[in-house]
Amino acid sequence: KSSNEATNITPKHNMKAFLDELKAENIKKFLYNFTQIPHLAGTEQNFQLAKQIQSQWKEFGLDSVELAHYDVLLSYPNKTHPNYISIINEDGNEIFNTSLFEPPPPGYENVSDIVPPFSAFSPQGMPEGDLVYVNYARTEDFFKLERDMKINCSGKIVIARYGKVFRGNKVKNAQLAGAKGVILYSDPADYFAPGVKSYPDGWNLPGGGVQRGNILNLNGAGDPLTPGYPANEYAYRRGIAEAVGLPSIPVHPIGYYDAQKLLEKMGGSAPPDSSWRGSLKVPYNVGPGFTGNFSTQKVKMHIHSTNEVTRIYNVIGTLRGAVEPDRYVILGGHRDSWVFGGIDPQSGAAVVHEIVRSFGTLKKEGWRPRRTILFASWDAEEFGLLGSTEWAEENSRLLQERGVAYINADSSIEGNYTLRVDCTPLMYSLVHNLTKELKSPDEGFEGKSLYESWTKKSPSPEFSGMPRISKLGSGNDFEVFFQRLGIASGRARYTKNWETNKFSGYPLYHSVYETYELVEKFYDPMFKYHLTVAQVRGGMVFELANSIVLPFDCRDYAVVLRKYADKIYSISMKHPQEMKTYSVSFDSLFSAVKNFTEIASKFSERLQDFDKSNPIVLRMMNDQLMFLERAFIDPLGLPDRPFYRHVIYAPSSHNKYAGESFPGIYDALFDIESKVDPSKAWGEVKRQIYVAAFTVQAAAETLSEVA
């Protein structure tokens, strides 16, 4: 195709035309359409939805829309042998059983194929034993139990409340503590907002509601049987014993009505402090075991789920770029849901659908983006980001050479208070500039910009007059693009005013009550927040695909690198004596950051001055910007986490959802005072400082003048 197509940009075909074409009413219709039946990964219903989306994206005007299928390990409950938990008496009789399903919401009583609550990838088993309450089952909670309270979880069944950290980390921590089973439950303290009714009368979790979810510890591997490579027709699959990230002990989730029955009998120690108490009318005793008259009773789990290799389908749509078709800007979000997916993922999928429609409308009028835009409807995100990861594994060579940016599009809302953005520092200025041009949907901010309401409601902790932008962690489909491949990435959604509860999700998360009506009645009746999120996500994609010079500012990376270096240095300085003894110095890292700052500043000056009409120089400067994120990738990966290769950011080893800066150094320093061989431990700290310093310096040099 002739690159002249790019000149087909009339004033009408600008960002404004794209944004004006986005309609709240369409998002609403798409959401309704996507949420009438369950779309569980690996099911016929989700395959049919994939084909529907393929067909509609073609109608919208994309150049091509293909299905990309993979055969990956999924997990399902046994339909004839349900999972449940019992309290058994000394004779082994079951005197209490947890519920087998969630009471269906009004209007959905006759829907078939609602998967009952389960922890995906739990092994089968029927362990019985004494219960220990482990709070959120975070690393620090197990430290409290084992080191302070001297409570041994070995051979016990632990019960943990959902929230604060990714459930897979909870299970990993329980396994390491020697537990033989894990019960996960939603405590009203975390999933029932005061003053709000439970569904269907409000957006709170009812007592019978349960959060589903996978409990893997994949660390970016994708399909557990084919780490590093696509699960295609000729794939070599590992045996189940060698599969990546599978839990080794049975796990099952319950609601707070059932949790009450287990927790009210708990004996042993009182909880260590107020942070271990939820909102149920129980003492929150830690155990081990039940109190007094109930001390001979035990808890028994009955788990019969099976792991099965199953076909999944991504939908990949292409809108070819007119000038730089070999440069890819990707907008992706998942399609599979646990049940109806009213928020997760369909509030995001509906927004993607409307963005595709708007781009398609412009294309039908003769416009093309400068760069190629790829649209993706990922499958099996809920089972461990499998669809996106397998596709990226299959296309890794193309992506690492051509990938400009990835914008994620899962749930558009987790509240209706303000915007929430997590992204690479390269996108800070893009996000700031874009949100200054968009209208705020917030009450009390009529006629004001989104930037203004966002900054007021969610101010940056470091820079006054600027909004908070968070680090990318994981738990969503950007992971493979950012953490493994080093493609600049970002995500945006509307959130709640609940900073302290950042990683707990909204009350009805992954429950049967996550319906269209939940969104339409309680979260966003006018779909104005969805529209705003569509404008932010779509606007970012438009700019990334269409601006002549990539809208990346490398100076913002310099600023955060200094902040992260200061932070990790201060953590290390909690051990001044050991730093002296083992000659630990951060000089090389600070020197590299200083060099990066100076080189980034000079690069930015050149970026203002160069001749943009020279396509070779333009391409060269853009490539330096595109490849900057790639320069932070260490091909060897992080220790024991080969698919987390970004040296500046990784998902926290203690919470997959959270991002950690300089993760290699951070993990080397973590709990270092408890290491049996301090010399070896501090040696690893020094090695990680070396890796980080080298990487920052190497990245800086990619911004230097090429000759």
Partner: antibody
Framework: EVQLVQSGAEVKKPGASVKVSCKTS????????IHWVRQAPGQSLEWMGN????????TYNQKFQGRVTITVDKSTSTAYMELSSLRSEDTAVYYC????????WGQGTLVTVSS | DIVMTQSPDSLAVSLGERATLSCRAS??????VDWYQQKPDQSPKLLIY???TRHTGVPDRFTGSGSGTDFTLTISSLQAEDVAVYFC?????????FGAGTKVEIK
């Protein structure tokens, strides 16, 4: 070696407040619960409350009806106990103890409440 | 509040003889009981936690036992340095409560 060093003796008038400090060393401060316990002359021990230094979570003995406040300063590995609206029966030795099971104790701080 | 009742109030035992100290909880506390030793003009020291586990460095002549409501601290062979007041404490429910103490002396 674990050490808890408390601030010196105090003499206070009824109605006043007292703030006792407890500087810890020899272990990871955030790892152990800090408790405050008092012992009136010739009497048994009375638990006042505790704090999780990692997150500031506290639990108080309701007997003290909001008169007691326990805080920590992680940067100096120091815990504090403030008791307000003092009365003569608050005259006691006040101890801090580290560890859920009161594994390590401070040397005690004598607080005398007298008009 | 759970009341911890210690008996006897005081106990005189010959050197090398066994001392048995009792502690009764007003309700079931499982095994959430500690024992402390306080020598004159000193801070208390932890001896036994979780009813029966000796704290680091505590001589093996000190043994804790019991569960539910009845707990015992036994000093198998009393030494001169064991002269002290011994307190039990429950942590099954808040507020944590101590017994009034048993004073151990040499006969």
């Amino acid at each position: 070696e674990v050490q808890l060093v408390q601030s010196g003796a105090e003499v206070k008038k009824p109605g006043a407040s007292v703030k006792v400090s407890c500087k810890t060393s020899g272990y990871t401060f955030t790892e152990y619960t800090i408790h405050w316990v008092r012992q009136a002359p010739g009497q048994s021990l009375e638990w006042m409350g505790n704090i999780n230094p990692n997150n500031g979570g506290t639990t108080y003995n309701q007997k003290f009806q909001g008169r007691v406040t326990i805080t920590v300063d992680k940067s100096t590995s120091t815990a504090y106990m403030e008791l307000s609206s003092l009365r003569s029966e608050d005259t006691a030795v006040y101890y801090c103890a580290a560890g859920w099971n009161f594994d390590y104790w401070g040397q005690g701080t004598l607080v005398t409440v007298s008009s | 509040d759970i009341v911890m009742t210690q008996s006897p109030d005081s106990l005189a035992v010959s050197l090398g003889e066994r001392a048995t100290l009792s502690c009764r909880a007003s309700q079931d506390v499982g095994t959430a009981v500690d024992w402390y030793q306080q020598k004159p003009d000193q801070s208390p020291k932890l001896l036994i936690y979780w009813a029966s586990t000796r704290h680091t460095g505590v001589p093996d002549r000190f043994t804790g036992s019991g569960s539910g409501t009845d707990f015992t601290l036994t000093i198998s062979s009393l030494q001169a340095e064991d002269v002290a007041v011994y307190f039990c404490q429950q942590y099954n429910s808040y507020p944590k409560t101590f017994g009034a103490g048993t004073k151990v002396e040499i006969k």
